[in-house]
């Protein structure tokens, strides 16, 4: 019992989740490309989800996609339209903690 407590204590000590940089608001022009960056780090490596206006982001082939990066995750929107306006939020979790950041796309 004592040793298992020590192991879990060590795991807790090594476990972390940090928002390294708040997401910026993005202003761009119709037809252009916008990129939103979710800069987080953690152990275990965090799972990152993207939301737009309170709902999970819908990926659109060749237009809207997100992918993991060395710093967290990047969401890219090509051929921007007025309908893309809104609040974009990334939510990262390492299984124990949760951090999030929100930016507005105009």
């Amino acid at each position: 019992p004592t040793s298992s407590w020590n192991i879990s204590s060590e795991l807790n000590k090594d476990s972390y989740l940090t928002l390294d940089e708040p997401m910026n608001n993005i202003t761009t022009s119709l037809g252009q490309t916008a990129e939103l960056h979710c800069k987080v780090s953690g152990n275990p490596p965090p799972t990152i989800r993207w939301f737009k206006n309170d709902a999970p982001v819908v990926q659109e082939p060749r237009r809207l996609s997100f992918r993991s990066t060395i710093y967290g995750s990047r969401l890219r929107i090509r051929n921007l339209d007025t309908t893309d306006t809104g609040y974009f939020q990334c939510v990262a979790t390492n299984g124990k903690e949760v951090v999030s950041s929100t930016g507005v796309l105009f």
Epitope: N25, T27, F51, K52, N53, D54, A55, P56, V57, V58, T82, T83, D84, T85, G86, Y87, Q89, T102, V104, F106
Partner: antibody
């Protein structure tokens, strides 16, 4: 308590102008989009225009583009809808509304509405 | 443009009835659908957001659900104060699109 109070409605002739006001209180005005939504007598809800007061980004329905102008004064916590070249089909109750903070669109607070009648 | 097709346009029901209103989006809007209630001469009131989240202060007899691009508002046991017009709205693509409305009348 969040409050939105519209004013400025009334009877106006076709081709005339009117300016609606939406006075906001109880929340950080510059942190939210403000929308105008209208409802013609006996009809459904129609989005008209929106603005983000902190950035002055503006958006319009095609039906009002070029005729209506939305603006905001953050020092007065008030949004405006300047309506020019009014037509009979603009007759409606006009509501200003505020969305939830995490949404640009879903409207959780509405004003009481102000009636605009366009008639000769 | 995104279309929100709401049905039925009107229905008659009695107090205590279970009432279901549906809305179909013309393309995926994720879970970003809201439902509003409007009574004559009054502003709309938010009931449900994110397809199934009950807005603060709204009675638990109201619920929402999603199946793909189909969204449903259910009133489990209709009360006298529930006779009104209900609108769906997609909240994913700015500036949002409203359904045509469903008027719930007394049978």
């Amino acid at each position: 308590e969040v409050q939105l109070v519209e004013s400025g409605g009334g009877l106006v002739q076709p081709g005339g102008s009117l300016r609606l006001s939406c006075a906001a209180s109880g929340f950080t005005f510059s942190s939210y989009f403000i929308h105008w939504v209208r409802q013609a007598p006996g009809k459904g809800l129609e989005w008209v225009a929106a603005i983000h007061p902190a950035f002055s980004f503006t958006y319009y329905a095609d039906s009002v583009k070029g005729r209506f102008t939305i603006s905001a004064d953050t020092s007065k916590n008030t949004a405006y809808l300047q309506m020019n070249s009014l037509r009979a089909e603009d007759t409606a109750v006009y509501y200003c509304a505020r969305p939830r903070l995490s949404s640009a669109v879903v409207l959780d607070y509405w004003g009481q509405g102000t009636l605009v009648t366009v008639s000769s | 443009d995104i279309q929100m097709t709401q049905s039925p346009s009107s229905l008659s029901a009695s107090v205590g009835d279970r009432v279901t209103i549906t809305c179909r989006a013309s393309q995926s809007v994720s879970s970003a659908v809201a439902w509003y209630q409007q009574k004559p001469g009054k502003a709309p009131k938010l009931l449900i957001y994110s397809a199934s989240s009950l807005y603060s202060g709204v009675p638990s007899r109201f619920s929402g659900s999603r199946s793909g691009t189909d969204f449903t508002l259910t009133i489990s046991s209709l009360q006298p104060e529930d006779f009104a017009t209900y609108y769906c709205q997609q909240g994913y693509y700015f500036p949002g699109t409203f359904g045509q409305g469903t008027k719930v009348e007394i049978k």
